[in-house]
């Protein structure tokens, strides 16, 4: 029986050009975490294997950094990064637990301010 629950950072927002940490935490189970996959829609961002460490998918290597912990850091954010992110915990013997985070990337306030008050 799967007793665990995943806590996530929930709905979060960040500024364009900035970075954000995606975090999930599995609790209420004694199951062994063998691997955590980080995903966005049908894309695999990264895998953290308990024995082998981190693998960042080549498409994201320049913008994704492992950690802290089992979390994932997204860098140089663009508005196209807005959307759902999933942490998939592969555990033994429980099976798979999934957490969801919604990220909204906003135009930076500096950019907005600059656009409104341009000097002619």
């Amino acid at each position: 029986m799967m007793t665990g629950t995943i806590e996530t950072t929930g709905n979060i927002s960040a500024e364009k050009g900035g970075s954000i940490i995606l975090q999930c935490h599995l609790s209420s189970t004694t199951a062994q975490v063998t691997q955590v996959n980080w995903e966005q829609q049908d894309q695999l961002l990264a895998i953290c294997n308990a024995d082998l460490g981190w693998h960042i998918s080549p498409s994201f290597k320049d913008r994704v950094a492992p950690g802290p912990g089992l979390g994932l850091t997204l860098q140089s954010l663009t508005v196209n990064d807005t959307g759902e992110y999933f942490c998939i915990y592969h555990t033994y013997p429980d099976g798979t637990y999934t957490g969801r985070i919604f990220l909204e990337v906003l135009e930076s306030s500096v950019a907005e301010h600059g656009a409104r008050f341009q000097i002619p």
């Epitope: 063998t34 691997q35 996959n37 995903e39 049908d42 894309q43 695999l44 895998i47 294997n49 308990a50 024995d51 082998l52 460490g53 981190w54 693998h55 998918s57 080549p58 498409s59 592969h90």
Partner: antibody
Framework: EVQLQESGPGLAKPSQTLSLACSVT????????WNWIRKFPGNKLEYMGY???????YYNPSLKSRISITRDTSKNQFYLQLNSVTTEDTATYYC??????????????WGQGTSVTVSS | DIVMTQSHTFMSTSVGDRVSITCKAS??????VAWYQQKPGQSPKLMIY???YRYTGVPDRFTGSGSGTDFTFTISSVQAEDLAVYYC?????????FGGGAKLEIQ
């Protein structure tokens, strides 16, 4: 360049223990992941398990009760032990390296393979 | 376990032809797929990882595509030396599993 070489008996009797060794040159087994994969007659490949850079092991659950992977870092060798073999274990056994950080679970270096027949 | 199905176990082609080998995963594996080439009497060689990335030294006539459950390995212009068995593999989760292989015959 990384080179792997399997060695061990080509013939085993049912119920015996199969022991194979893999000698690695050009790279230290204290980095990356060191794996055993077998190919059955008729081409089917089966992933058997690994020993990691730190000495942690993973075994395919289909073999878990029969398999052991160990290493000797002073000799830069790792080993496969498969207990209670049957004719179904007749296969070509490959040792292989996996660079998880760069390629995930894709195996980038393979030994040439050693053929094992289980027969009474 | 995730099952990787290569429905065409045998494919016949001619030098210069374009050939595609398909692989279907029993569940969504995103892009965690590799392709290998095994020539007669040799060990497998890594060709593609992360569904579409060519491994070091692999000629650009070999390409990989797909995500989710459906994957394709394409040789744009088959050469005589491409005679081999081609395998897909998923590494989305352990145990990592392979397809049954597709044998490419050159006419």
């Amino acid at each position: 360049e990384v080179q792997l070489q399997e060695s061990g008996p080509g013939l085993a009797k049912p119920s015996q223990t199969l022991s194979l060794a893999c000698s690695v040159t050009g790279y230290s087994i204290t980095s990356d992941s060191w794996n055993w994969i077998r190919k059955f007659p008729g081409n089917k490949l089966e992933y058997m398990g690994y020993i990691s850079y730190s000495g942690n092991t993973y075994y395919n659950p289909s073999l878990k009760s029969r398999i052991s992977i160990t290493r000797d870092t002073s000799k830069n060798q790792f080993y496969l032990q498969l207990n209670s073999v049957t004719t179904e274990d007749t296969a070509t056994y490959y040792c292989a390296r996996l660079d998880f950080s760069n390629y995930g679970g894709a195996v980038d270096y393979w030994g040439q393979g050693t053929s094992v027949t289980v027969s009474s | 376990d995730i099952v990787m199905t290569q429905s065409h176990t045998f494919m016949s082609t001619s030098v210069g032809d374009r050939v595609s080998i398909t692989c279907k995963a029993s569940q969504n594996v995103r892009t965690a797929v590799a392709w290998y080439q095994q020539k007669p009497g040799q060990s497998p060689k890594l060709m593609i990882y992360s569904a579409s990335y060519r491994y070091t030294g692999v000629p650009d006539r070999f390409t990989g595509s797909g995500s989710g459950t459906d994957f394709t390995f394409t040789i744009s212009s088959v050469q005589a030396e491409d005679l081999a068995v081609y395998y897909c593999q998923q590494y989305y989760t352990t145990p990592w599993t392979f397809g049954g292989g597709a044998k490419l015959e050159i006419q």
